[in-house]
Amino acid sequence: PEPPTACREKQYLINSQCCSLCQPGQKLVSDCTEFTETECLPCGESEFLDTWNRETHCHQHKYCDPNLGLRVQQKGTSETDTICTCEEGWHCTSEACESCVLHRSCSPGFGVKQIATGVSDTICEPCPVGFFSNVSSAFEKCHPWTSCETKDLVVQQAGTNKTDVVCGPQDRLRA
């Protein structure tokens, strides 16, 4: 019969013959022959292969470097690489999460619209009229101005986006 020019999925062509690829978590030891199957071996400690493959060496698991703010989210297996994430208060600088940066804080006059996660930074928004933030924070939202009326008080000093209103007693009519 004619030697194949293409092979099925999870196979590869070598010496005019279709051989089975090694499954994830295993590396190639020897190609198949007319009489023998492909020989594969499991990846060892600290190694992985995450696809059907014909690699003769497994890849090393990545290291979550605490000096870069990283910690282990999930350790590697023979079929998966280690997944790193950032320490509390930090987030990844890229999708691959190779290093971390400190979450940004929202300055006075701005509040947190969305709290940062291990993979996304803080999203800030300006405090609209009627709201304020007087701190630099990665957690605080804009707070509504105090309602003087509900306390039977009057506004003595108007609020801004950075300060609350100042309430005071109502002027009493003298008898």
Epitope: S46, E47, H57, Q60, K75, T77
Partner: antibody, heavy 120, light 106 residues
Framework: QIQLLQSGAELVKPGASVKLSCTAS????????MHWVKQRPEQGLEWIGR????????KSDPKFQGKATITSDTSSNTAYLQLSSLTSEDTAVYYC?????????????WGQGTLVTVSS | QIVLTQSPAIMSASPGEKVTITCSAS?????MHWFQQKPGTSPKIWIY???NLASGVPARFSGSGSGTSYSLTISRMEAEDAATYYC?????????FGAGTKLELK
């Protein structure tokens, strides 16, 4: 900082069993593979096996199957090595050594070792 | 299982002398780790993934190799280097250690 505290020395009779412990601090054992290594007096190092505390799966050297059982308890952050049907050949220091994924290199930390003496 | 053969089993070296310890694997391995052990103490990782020095290991140490042949070299022997060195492969289960090389100061 990271530390591994192993249980104290054991003097046991032939045929008996013993269970050694290795308690980790400074990291979560679920982020490591916990290995056990044997060293007989004046001899070299022998790998017994390891456990993945995240799922309880173990791998071990076939020559220790039936002799050594590795378990772990994530609530106490502890790995265990149980040795059964003890003989004089089992007299050795037993070390635990995690392959911890928050460390730059594997086997960066070792316990102080537990001496098991098998004698009647 | 992969057998690691270390040579020599025992050797002595004078201060300043170059020392090479070899580790031969019965089958090809992806990498080799080296451990140092002194009497009465736990082993210490010394060289990892063939050629990387662990923290605190002097730069006079180096590691190299591939396939079935690996080595640890000390460019200039010092008294504190006297110890037993073990190679270990982790690329195939079961993990295996070499029998060790005892390095003494002459």
């Amino acid at each position: 900082q990271i530390q591994l505290l192993q249980s104290g020395a054991e003097l046991v009779k032939p045929g008996a069993s013993v269970k050694l412990s290795c308690t980790a601090s400074g990291f979560n054992i679920k982020d490591a593979y916990m290995h056990w290594v044997k060293q007989r007096p004046e001899q070299g190092l022998e790998w017994i096996g390891r456990i993945d505390p995240a799922n309880g799966y173990t791998k071990s050297d076939p020559k220790f199957q039936g002799k050594a059982t590795i378990t772990s308890d994530t609530s106490s952050n502890t790995a265990y090595l149980q040795l059964s049907s003890l003989t004089s050949e089992d007299t050795a220091v037993y070390y635990c050594a995690p392959n911890y994924y928050g460390s730059r290199y594997p086997f960066a930390y070792w316990g102080q070792g537990t001496l098991v003496t098998v004698s009647s | 299982q992969i057998v690691l053969t270390q040579s020599p089993a025992i050797m002595s070296a004078s201060p300043g002398e170059k020392v090479t310890i070899t580790c031969s694997a019965s089958s090809s391995v992806s990498y080799m780790h080296w451990f140092q052990q002194k009497p009465g103490t736990s082993p210490k990782i010394w060289i990892y993934f063939t050629s990387n020095l662990a923290s605190g290991v002097p730069a006079r140490f180096s590691g190299s190799g591939s396939g079935t042949s690996y080595s640890l070299t000390i460019s200039r022997m010092e008294a504190e280097d006297a110890a037993t060195y073990y190679c270990q492969q982790g690329s195939t289960y079961p993990l295996t250690f070499g029998a060790g090389t005892k390095l003494e100061l002459k």
